[in-house]
C-alpha cells in the first residue's frame, strides 16, 4: 500500500482550510478522549479510478468520497482519518485530513474526496473514514467502512495499468491444445516480443476429480527476435493411464519486468464424451 504522488495532496476547498498529513492510524483522540465529538460520515462511496504519476505511469487508485451529516456536530469536527486495509496481508495505510479552520453550515452539504491510495489488481480492501476526534470508549461510532475488490489484470481497463503491464498483461498467447494419437498433446501459443524463456506446465486429472494423476514440465528456450509474435508448437507425451484424460496446460513466461511472477495463461482439454452404451438386443424366439 502506498500513496500516489505524495506532494500533490490537497483537501482544502472553498470555506475550509485543510491539510493532508501522514497518519500512524492511531489518532491522538484514542489516547486522550474528548467530551464532544462529531457524528459519523454519510454516504461513503468507494470507486475504482485510474491516475497517472508525474512519470506517466498509470495506476489504479481508490477514489474515496463522503459527505457530512447536517447536524451541529460539525462545530466539533477537527478532521478525518482515512484508512485503507488490505485484507489478505493486514497491511494498513492511513492519512489524516486536518482542518485548519472551523466548519460552518453553508447552502451545500459538505463533501470530501481523496484519490491517492494506490491499490493492487485482484486485492480486496476495507476503506474506513473516521471523523476526528474519535468518540469516547462508550460513545456512538463516528466512522463508516466499505469493502472493495479490485479487478484482476484480465479486466479490460486494468490490463493497461502499469502494474498489470509489468506482469505481462498485454501478452495474449492464444493457446490451443489438441489431442493427438499415441497419448500426445500438441500445444501451440503465440510468443511475446521478448527474448525470454517459457515453461509449459501440464497437469492431468481423472474425469470429474481434482487430484492430479500426471504432471509434466516442459522448458521452452528464449526465442530469437525473428520468432517474436510467431506460434510456438510443442508436442507433449502423456502417461498412458486409463481415465487420466482431463489436461490443464499452463504457460508461464519469464519476462524481464516480472521474472518468475508473471501472469500465467492456461487452457484445459476435457475428457472425451463417453458414447451412450447401445441398448442390448433382447433374445427372442422366432415364431415359426
Amino acid at each position: 500500500l502506498r500513496l500516489l504522488d505524495h506532494r500533490a495532496l490537497v483537501c482544502s476547498q472553498p470555506g475550509l482550510n485543510c491539510t493532508v498529513k501522514n497518519s500512524t492510524c492511531l489518532d491522538d483522540s484514542w489516547i486522550h478522549p474528548r467530551n464532544l465529538t462529531p457524528s459519523s460520515p454519510k454516504d461513503l462511496q468507494i470507486q475504482l479510478h485510474f491516475a497517472h504519476t508525474q512519470q506517466g505511469d498509470l495506476f489504479p487508485v481508490a477514489h474515496i468520497e463522503w459527505t457530512l451529516q447536517t447536524d451541529a456536530s460539525i462545530l466539533y469536527l477537527e478532521g478525518a482519518e482515512l484508512s485503507v486495509l488490505q485484507l489478505n496481508t493486514n497491511e494498513r495505510l492511513c492519512v489524516r485530513f486536518e482542518f485548519l479552520s472551523k466548519l460552518r453550515h453553508h447552502h451545500r452539504r459538505w463533501r470530501f474526496t481523496f484519490s491517492h491510495f494506490v491499490v493492487d489488481p485482484d486485492q480486496e480492501y476495507e476503506v474506513t473514514v473516521h471523523h476526528l476526534p474519535k468518540p469516547i470508549p462508550d460513545g456512538d461510532p463516528n466512522h463508516q467502512s466499505k469493502n472493495f475488490l479490485v479487478p484482476d489484470c484480465e479486466h479490460a481497463r486494468m490490463k493497461v495499468t502499469t502494474p498489470c503491464m509489468s506482469s505481462g498483461s498485454l501478452w495474449d498467447p492464444n493457446i490451443t491444445v489438441e489431442t493427438l494419437e499415441a497419448h500426445q498433446l500438441r500445444v501451440s501459443f503465440t510468443l511475446w516480443n521478448e527474448s525470454t524463456h517459457y515453461q509449459i506446465l501440464l497437469t492431468s486429472f481423472p474425469h470429474m476429480e481434482n487430484h492430479s494423476c500426471f504432471e509434466h514440465m516442459h522448458h521452452i528456450p528464449a526465442p530469437r527476435p525473428e520468432e517474436f509474435h510467431q506460434r510456438s508448437n510443442v508436442t507433449l507425451t502423456l502417461r498412458n493411464l486409463k481415465g487420466c484424460c482431463r489436461h490443464q496446460v499452463q504457460i508461464q513466461p519469464f519476462f524481464s519486468s516480472c521474472l518468475n511472477d508473471c501472469l500465467r495463461h492456461s487452457a484445459t482439454v476435457s475428457c472425451p464424451e463417453m458414447p451412450d452404451t447401445p441398448e442390448p438386443i433382447p433374445d427372442y424366439m422366432p415364431l415359426w
Epitope: Q45, L48, H63, F148, L149, V150, D152, A156
Partner: nanobody, 127 residues
Framework: EVQLVESGGGLVQPGRSLRLSCAAS????????MHWVRQAPGKGLEWVSG????????DYADSVKGRFTISRDNAKNSLFLQMNSLRPEDTALYFC????????????????????WGQGTMVTVSS
C-alpha cells in the same frame, strides 16, 4: 439507452425453485460487477447477492446463503439468480443493479454503490 430488464418472477409454492434473469444493454456489461437486491412488501431494500465482473467472486446475504446462486453470462449480457428451497419470507420485488465503479463492493454494504437499476420482477412464495 442503458437499461436492465428482469424476468422470471412469479407465484411459487414453498420449497420450490425459480430462476430470475436480468438482461443488460447500453453499457459494457462484462466490465462491471452486478448485484441482486430485493424489497419485501412494506419493507426497505435488502441486498441479496453480488458477483464480480468475471464471476471470480460471489457473495450472498446470510438469509439466502446455501439456497440462492448468482451467475452471469458476459457473452449474452445476462445476470441470473437461481433460487432454490424458496420460503414465504423470500416474497419480494427483486431488482438487478449495476455497480457505478469498475471495482466490486463486497460485504453487502453496497446499496448506494449502484447507478443503474431494473424495474424489478415480483416473486411470491405462498401455498
Amino acid at each position: 439507452e442503458v437499461q436492465l430488464v428482469e424476468s422470471g418472477g412469479g407465484l411459487v409454492q414453498p420449497g420450490r425453485s425459480l430462476r430470475l434473469s436480468c438482461a443488460a444493454s447500453g453499457f459494457a456489461f462484462a466490465d462491471y460487477a452486478m448485484h441482486w437486491v430485493r424489497q419485501a412488501p412494506g419493507k426497505g431494500l435488502e441486498w441479496v447477492s453480488g458477483i464480480s465482473w468475471n464471476s471470480g467472486r460471489k457473495d450472498y446475504a446470510d438469509s439466502v446463503k446455501g439456497r440462492f446462486t448468482i451467475s452471469r453470462d458476459n457473452a449474452k449480457n445476462s445476470l441470473f439468480l437461481q433460487m432454490n428451497s424458496l420460503r414465504p419470507e423470500d416474497t419480494a420485488l427483486y431488482f438487478c443493479a449495476k455497480e457505478r465503479s469498475l471495482g466490486y463492493c463486497s460485504g453487502g454494504t453496497c446499496s448506494d454503490a449502484f447507478d443503474i437499476w431494473g424495474q424489478g420482477t415480483m416473486v411470491t412464495v405462498s401455498s
